[in-house]
């Protein structure tokens, strides 16, 4: 009997009530592997979740978060609210970054500004709550007669990783 069940492909289940006949998964259920004795209920993306991929007979639905929220956990098991740039999400809600820290993302916590002097450089542009400082040449390079520094070309700041 076990051999009959192993022949049931994904998208079906081995129906014990019908002598191990392979029956299609009922609506709103799926089986992603063969030989299953039951089909799993499809995930429903409700509330702060939105559907990224519809459920099929062989694969579960995939959820994302609605605007203003971001995913946490495997398969986006949770949605957490976004904050504004220049803020961090604490357990008591969104809070402005303290002086000397910044956050250029809508999630995560505030990061200390770069200390340019640690690499022998000077501050070219001051930091803000939303942006890190920009380091320029070393103070010695800025002595009279030295050529003026050219600010670095803007590039994409480190951003969200795909969940």
């Amino acid at each position: 009997l076990q051999d009959l069940c192993s022949n049931c492909p994904a998208g079906t289940f081995c129906d014990n009530n019908r002598s191990q006949i392979c029956s299609p998964c009922p609506p709103n259920s799926f089986s992603s592997a063969g030989g299953q004795r039951t089909c799993d209920i499809c995930r429903q993306c409700k509330g702060v979740f939105k559907t990224r991929k519809e459920c099929s007979s062989t694969s579960n639905a995939e959820c994302d978060c609605i605007s203003g929220y971001h995913c946490l956990g495997a398969e986006c098991s949770m949605c957490e609210q976004d904050c504004k740039q220049g803020q961090e999400l604490t357990k008591k809600g969104c809070k402005d970054c303290c002086f000397g820290t910044f956050n250029d993302q809508k999630r995560g916590i505030c990061r200390p500004w770069t200390n340019c002097s640690l690499d022998g450089k000077s501050v070219l542009v001051n930091g803000t709550k939303e942006r890190d400082v920009v380091c320029g040449p070393s103070p010695a390079d800025l002595s009279p007669g030295a050529s003026s520094a050219t600010p670095p070309a803007p590039a994409r700041e480190p951003g969200h990783s795909p969940q």
Epitope: Q105, V133, S161
Partner: antibody, heavy 120, light 110 residues
Framework: QVQLVQSGAEVKKPGASVKVSCKAS????????MHWVRQAPGQGLEWMGW????????NYAQKFQGRVTMTRDTSISTAYMELSRLRSDDTAVYYC?????????????WGQGTLVTVSS | SYVLTQPPSVSVAPGETARITCGGD??????VHWYQKKPDQAPVLVVY???YRPSGIPERISGSNSGNTATLTLSRVEAGDEADYYC????????????FGGGTQLIILG
Amino acid sequence: QVQLVQSGAEVKKPGASVKVSCKASGYTFTGYYMHWVRQAPGQGLEWMGWINPNSGGTNYAQKFQGRVTMTRDTSISTAYMELSRLRSDDTAVYYCAREPGYYGSGLDYWGQGTLVTVSS
Amino acid sequence: SYVLTQPPSVSVAPGETARITCGGDDIGDKRVHWYQKKPDQAPVLVVYEDRYRPSGIPERISGSNSGNTATLTLSRVEAGDEADYYCQVWDSSSDHPGVFGGGTQLIILG
């Protein structure tokens, strides 16, 4: 898929410097901060610092300030960690690890580690 | 700078539940991450931001955090869970933002 591949083992004499490389692939190198963490024999994990591969901005643990320099070459998607004035207690496995796109979460991908042995 | 305190070892029989603690002042206000470290292997992130599992980490691994203690729980432990486990937080207010606990060796009995 994301991969961080580090340079091979090094043996150095006290007072020398070592430069460990970490080549990234499978993602946009400039989009994610890179951290360095080490583990000495029989000891725990120790955070050393980070670099923003986009701007080159760094932050070092105070313990290593003045001895460590983190740099990057965006043209070859590689981060570097140089430690100078080596001592015997710098003998450790050094790891690079990627931050997942925002500060405050766990380090999601790690290099395989580089053993640095400091011995006279 | 911020200090995280872990027990040096925790012993548990196969199939039982292991709980590894990580203590710190008001750690419940911080986001705690947990790594599994096996000999001659790189650390693996098993729980991030107190209680979330990355893809590929089994559901029997979970985390919690409140007050002065964060806890990593491994239920139905297996021989393959034997490893060192480290908690970690970010402390932006200090000159050492990345802080790891001392690590806990999980010993599977029998």
